[in-house]
């Protein structure tokens, strides 16, 4: 008897973080033997949607013409072949921004930082929230850090970084959210440009560089105690 069918691949275009009102397409890619594709949404009646495969039958398209709160959540897809249903795909977390008013992002003590020193990015919301997210534009992993204050409602979250280096430099934004729905985020804050001075760009280690020089180590992952997040929204609780 053959083993279980391989799980399909699930992804979203143009991405998994979508502003309110924008369109998004969810793709499920299985095998050429697929006869039908099914998309399930967590905490919704299954199936959330069914689609016939597009030629050459190895994938299906699920279209969301206008993003709203109802579409935000965690999805998995399956495909049916002549021998039965596949294993579920890895989950896709579809996040909607624009659910709440934008927070304010600032840098303490200053957005101009010397390499080898520290900076704290402060995300502040007008109304109390329990979850804050910091992103860095054009980062390999743009959704970097989410924290919850033990369920307590807070007006702000601090994101400490040390030691700062040239890699920390760039444009940051933050979002806020409520714990009851981590898939609904605020509008993004206005951008904050972090400028790191005194950095030496050197692709190889220098055995004689000491702390008295201007150079600093590269940036650390912004996840507090975890590894760099993968695609989609990776949460870390404190």
């Amino acid at each position: 008897q053959a083993g279980p069918l391989p799980k399909p691949t699930l992804w979203a275009e143009p991405g998994s973080v979508i502003s309110w009102g924008n369109s998004v397409t969810i793709w499920c890619q299985g095998t050429l033997e697929a006869r039908e594709y099914r998309l399930d949404k967590e905490e919704s009646p299954a199936p959330w949607d069914r689609q016939n495969p597009l030629e050459p039958k190895n994938k299906a398209r699920f279209s969301i013409p206008s993003m709203t709160e109802d579409y935000a959540g965690r999805y998995r897809c399956y495909y049916r072949s002549p021998v039965g249903w596949s294993q579920p795909s890895d989950p896709l977390e579809l996040v909607m921004t624009g659910a709440y008013s934008k927070p304010t992002l600032s840098a303490l003590p200053s957005p101009l930082v010397t390499s080898g020193k520290s900076v704290t990015l402060l995300c502040q919301s007008r109304s109390p929230m329990d979850t804050f997210l910091l992103i860095k534009e054009r980062a390999a992993h743009p959704l970097l850090h989410l924290r919850s204050e033990h369920g307590a409602q807070q007006h702000q979250a601090e994101f400490p970084m040390s030691p700062v280096t040239s890699v920390h430099g760039g444009t940051y934004r933050c979002f806020s959210s409520h714990g009851f729905s981590h898939y609904l985020l605020s509008h993004p804050s206005d951008p904050l440009e972090l400028i790191v001075s005194g950095s030496l760009e050197d692709p190889r280690p220098s055995p004689t560089r000491s702390v008295s020089t201007a150079a600093g180590p590269e940036d650390q992952p912004l996840m507090p105690t975890g590894s760099v997040p993968h695609s989609g929204l990776r949460r870390h609780w404190e």
């Epitope: 040390s162 180590p217 590269e218 650390q220």
Partner: antibody
Framework: EVQLVESGGGLVKPGGSLRLSCAAS????????MHWVRQAPGKGLEWVSY????????YYADTVKGRFTISRDNAKNSLYLQMNSLRAEDTAVYYC???????????WGQGTLVTVSS | DIQMTQSPSSLSASVGDRVTITCRAS??????LNWYQQKPGKAPKLLIY???RLHSGVPSRFSGSGSGTDFTFTISSLQPEDIATYFC?????????FGGGTKLEIK
């Protein structure tokens, strides 16, 4: 479970060399900066050196600058400290520690003792 | 370099006591102050980072406070397993520096 295991310590004469190793497991080593910290017998902690994940930039304490070299091999999940021109005052337990990106060292190895004596 | 002054250097307390250790930085380090516990013959363990955030798995009887140059570490109710030496460390500016340590003993 995060684990850091140092090795390579021992007795060496003044002016001699040693190479310490730190084997990491239980986390994605290439995602983290790493430190060496030392502790002389009965004394406090002294930060020695820091290397970030890609080895592109490095820091040393002034007390070891020019004598010690920190390096890493991400493919082997290993951190190293090459110690040359050793002095009696370098005698200490040497710990490797993982950087948390916020100014702290969140996990430490058990340490390896380096004794510099004639 | 930033100097870290920790006091007292030793402390004797009874089980159930509230224990407080202080750490002073020679210049402003914002909240980049960490506390470690070290038992004899063992490696240090991170207890508190960024002044007051508890590292994973650390009991809630440990806490920290402060900002700028003056910081406090507190054990709300001393337990026998808390007998150790405690170090503060600034992570604001390289080179990172440690306090001299506080050796905690049971009365």
């Amino acid at each position: 479970e995060v684990q850091l295991v140092e090795s390579g310590g021992g007795l060496v004469k003044p002016g001699g060399s040693l190479r310490l190793s730190c084997a990491a497991s239980g986390f994605t080593f290439s995602d983290y900066g790493m430190h060496w910290v030392r502790q002389a017998p009965g004394k406090g902690l002294e930060w020695v050196s820091y290397i970030f994940s890609g080895s592109s930039t490095i820091y040393y304490a002034d007390t070891v600058k020019g004598r010690f070299t920190i390096s890493r091999d991400n493919a082997k999940n290993s951190l190293y400290l090459q110690m040359n021109s050793l002095r009696a005052e370098d005698t200490a337990v040497y710990y490797c520690a993982r950087a948390d990106g916020r100014g702290a060292m969140d996990y430490w190895g058990q340490g390896t003792l380096v004794t510099v004596s004639s | 370099d930033i100097q870290m002054t920790q006091s007292p250097s030793s402390l004797s307390a009874s089980v159930g006591d509230r224990v407080t250790i202080t750490c002073r930085a020679s210049q402003d380090i914002s909240k980049f102050l960490n506390w470690y516990q070290q038992k004899p013959g063992k490696a240090p363990k991170l207890l508190i980072y960024y002044t007051s955030r508890l590292h994973s798995g650390v009991p809630s009887r440990f806490s920290g406070s402060g900002s700028g140059t003056d910081f406090t570490f507190t054990i709300s109710s001393l337990q026998p397993e808390d007998i150790a030496t405690y170090f503060c460390q600034q992570g604001n500016t390289l080179p990172w520096t440690f306090g001299g340590g506080t050796k905690l003993e049971i009365k």
